[in-house]
Interface confidence: medium
């Protein structure tokens, strides 16, 4: 898991396309000492991938998450 | 420059094991999410397995779980393929490959492989 | 698992275009890369996330991706065009994440 590192987990990049919306149940926000900003979309299985916040796909899945 | 270089393939008879090892130059390697994928003579591309870039997360195919084992050491910059209970049907090209975009810890970002090593040849026979 | 059903082969003359079909249940959903492998050589990545092309990769490479199929197109097919294809895409939160396509046979009459 991301978080047993002892330094900060970051993205360095983005997935291009967005995930397929059922397979995702949750979602949290790296650092804020990243260089690069990004959401981490957590899947059924726990994979964890990195997405851009600024995409309007992830946004809309971000708030699909929070009403559901 | 990128390289991956694979070693350890050869001729083993069935029911046998091999390490396969790929070593890995150019890049920060525990970036990076590593796969190895193979293809028998004459066939297709088949993926075998799969490692996060801290080695947290590991896939496999069916068609080789339980009998192979995907591990790696960042230290080393080095991948590997425990090879266990092989069968005739193993025979063929291993590739090691890097998964493109992904990152450390075990995030994902990419998906597709953008360095491939030239392979060694696994030859399961009696 | 999912499955990538590829043409075992397409012939095209040179100057032509060449299309490699993918086909796979709603593609078009998925993230998907193409491969070039020539005889006794490995792989090399030509199409990446459906449309991107790797930096050294020629701009006679093109690729889409809608529906059920997805195409990988080769304008202006040289003779060093004539390779083995594969499609593969990444099915997130698949047991079996990676999968290729059978791979097609480009041949360059």
């Known amino acids: 898991s991301p978080y047993s590192s002892d330094t900060t987990p970051c993205c360095f990049a983005y997935i291009a396309r967005p995930l397929p919306r059922a397979h995702i149940k949750e979602y949290f926000y790296t650092s804020g000492k990243c260089s690069n900003p990004a959401v981490v979309f957590v899947t059924r299985k726990n994979r964890q991938v990195c997405a851009n916040p600024e995409k309007k796909w992830v946004r809309e899945y971000i708030n699909s998450l929070e009403m559901s | 420059e990128v390289q991956l270089l694979e070693s350890g393939g050869g001729l083993v008879q069935p029911g046998g094991s091999l390490r396969l090892s790929c070593a890995a130059s150019g890049f920060t390697f525990s970036s990076y999410a590593m796969s190895w994928v193979r293809q028998a003579p004459g066939k297709g591309l088949e993926w075998v397995s799969a490692i996060s870039g801290s080695g947290g997360s590991t896939y496999y195919a069916d068609s080789v779980k339980g009998r192979f084992t995907i591990s790696r050491d960042n230290s080393k910059n080095t991948l590997y393929l425990q090879m266990n209970s092989l069968r005739a049907e193993d025979t063929a090209v291993y590739y090691c490959?890097?998964?493109?975009?992904?990152?450390?810890?075990?995030?994902?970002?990419?998906?597709?492989?953008?360095?491939w090593g030239q392979g060694t040849m696994v030859t399961v026979s009696s | 698992s999912y499955v990538l059903t590829q043409p075992p082969s397409v012939s095209v003359a040179p100057g032509k275009t060449a299309s490699i079909s993918c086909g796979g249940d709603?593609?078009?959903?998925?993230?998907v890369h193409w491969y070039q492998q020539k005889p006794g050589q490995a792989p090399v990545l030509v199409i990446y996330y459906d449309t991107d092309r790797p930096s050294g990769i020629p701009e006679r490479f093109s690729g889409s991706n809608s529906g059920n199929t997805a195409t990988l197109s080769i304008s202006r097919v040289e003779a060093a065009d004539e390779a083995d294809y594969y499609c593969?895409?990444?099915?997130?939160?698949?047991?079996?994440?990676?999968?290729f396509g059978g791979g097609t046979k480009l041949t360059v009459l």
């Open positions: 709603n593609i078009g959903g998925q993230n």
């Open positions: 593969q895409v990444w099915d997130v939160d698949s047991d079996h994440p990676w999968v």
């Open positions: 490959a890097r998964v493109r975009g992904s990152s450390q810890y075990d995030f994902w970002s990419g998906s597709e492989f953008d360095y």
